[in-house]
């Protein structure tokens, strides 16, 4: 399941990488690929007690 | 709910070909990056490689030129093929989906065992 | 290849009482991005591995808030504060900033005394 980007800020973004937005890093191929060929299960804070939704890759992680 | 299903043979003999199937609902593989994990008797978890969205494929050298991955979109399914078996083979075999923003293995199939033995 | 070092294999402890599980790396896990992708996983008997924990301290959903892991680095610390009958299995550390291949630990086993 894909949706389009959504910006990533706060406690878990990580230091920026040279991706353009909707673009995201693609840690095993190193280099950036659009956000929808990543797939995720974003975690959601602590303590929730229902499993993360599916989401799309947020830009730049 | 994304969900990950190994199918194959649980007895193989030795010098011949493990083959698995993973069935993949709930999340298309051409999207993600789609693992074999195996674990040995005694706990060790070894990572054997990958299928990437594009169809590219990463494997583990320790298994050098014995092991390959492929996929059939068609189907939503993807393979392992590990040629020329010892009883050292002998483990648990897993598929797995990778989360592509923190890089952890998010989805695991429920694993099959295969026994390598004559 | 990141080899991950996991102490103790074994674990005994008692209902109630908190455990504590080393990981350590043989080199640095943190990403050239700032992140340090260093996570815990729980394998259950007769059950397949699952996330606990990712990026060295974050609880993944569902996690209860007596699992914390800490660490920077190459040390790392998974702590369970009061162990319940649930918590029993297998734990593994894994990396994924040095990658391909993903490593994993060699497995903690924790146990009822």
């Known amino acids: 399941m894909r949706r389009g980007p959504r910006s990533l800020r706060g406690r878990d973004a990580p230091a920026p990488t040279p991706c353009v937005p909707a673009e995201c890093f693609d840690l095993l191929v190193r280099h950036c690929v659009a956000c929808g060929l990543l797939r995720t299960a974003r975690p959601k804070p602590a303590g929730a007690s229902s499993p993360a939704p599916r989401t799309a890759l947020q830009p730049q992680e | 709910d994304v969900q990950l299903q190994e199918s194959g043979p649980s007895l193989v003999k030795p010098s011949q070909t493990l083959s698995l199937t993973c069935s993949v609902t709930?999340?298309?593989?051409?999207?993600?990056?789609w693992n074999w994990i195996r674990k040995f008797p005694g706990n060790k978890l070894e990572y054997m490689g990958y299928?990437?969205?594009?169809?590219?494929?990463y494997y583990n050298p320790s298994l050098k030129s014995r092991i390959s991955i492929t996929r059939d979109t068609s189907k939503n399914q993807f393979y392992l093929q590990l040629l020329s078996v010892t009883t050292e083979d002998t483990a648990t075999y897993y598929c797995?989906?990778?989360?592509?923003?923190?890089?952890?293995?998010?989805?695991w199939g429920a694993g099959t065992l295969v026994t390598v033995s004559s | 290849d990141i080899v991950m070092t996991q102490t103790p294999l074994s674990l005994p402890v008692s209902l109630g009482d908190q455990a504590s599980i080393s990981c350590r790396s043989s080199?640095?896990?943190?990403?050239?991005?700032?992140?340090?992708?260093l996570h815990w996983y729980l394998q259950k008997p007769g059950q397949s591995p699952k996330l606990l924990i990712y990026?060295?301290?974050n609880r993944f959903s569902g996690v209860p808030d007596r699992f914390s892991g800490s660490g920077s680095g190459t040390d790392f610390t998974l702590k369970i504060s009061r162990v319940e009958a649930e918590d029993l299995g297998v734990y593994f550390c894994?990396?994924?900033?040095?990658?391909?291949?993903?490593?994993f630990g060699s497995g903690t086993k924790l146990e009822i005394k």
């Open positions: 797995a989906g990778l989360d592509g923003l923190y890089w952890y293995f998010d989805v």
């Open positions: 894994s990396q994924s900033t040095h990658v391909p291949p993903f490593t």
């Open positions: 299928i990437s969205y594009s169809g590219s494929t």
């Open positions: 080199q640095s896990l943190v990403h050239s991005n700032g992140n340090t992708y």
């Open positions: 990026k060295v301290s």
């Open positions: 709930g999340d298309s593989i051409t999207s993600g990056y």
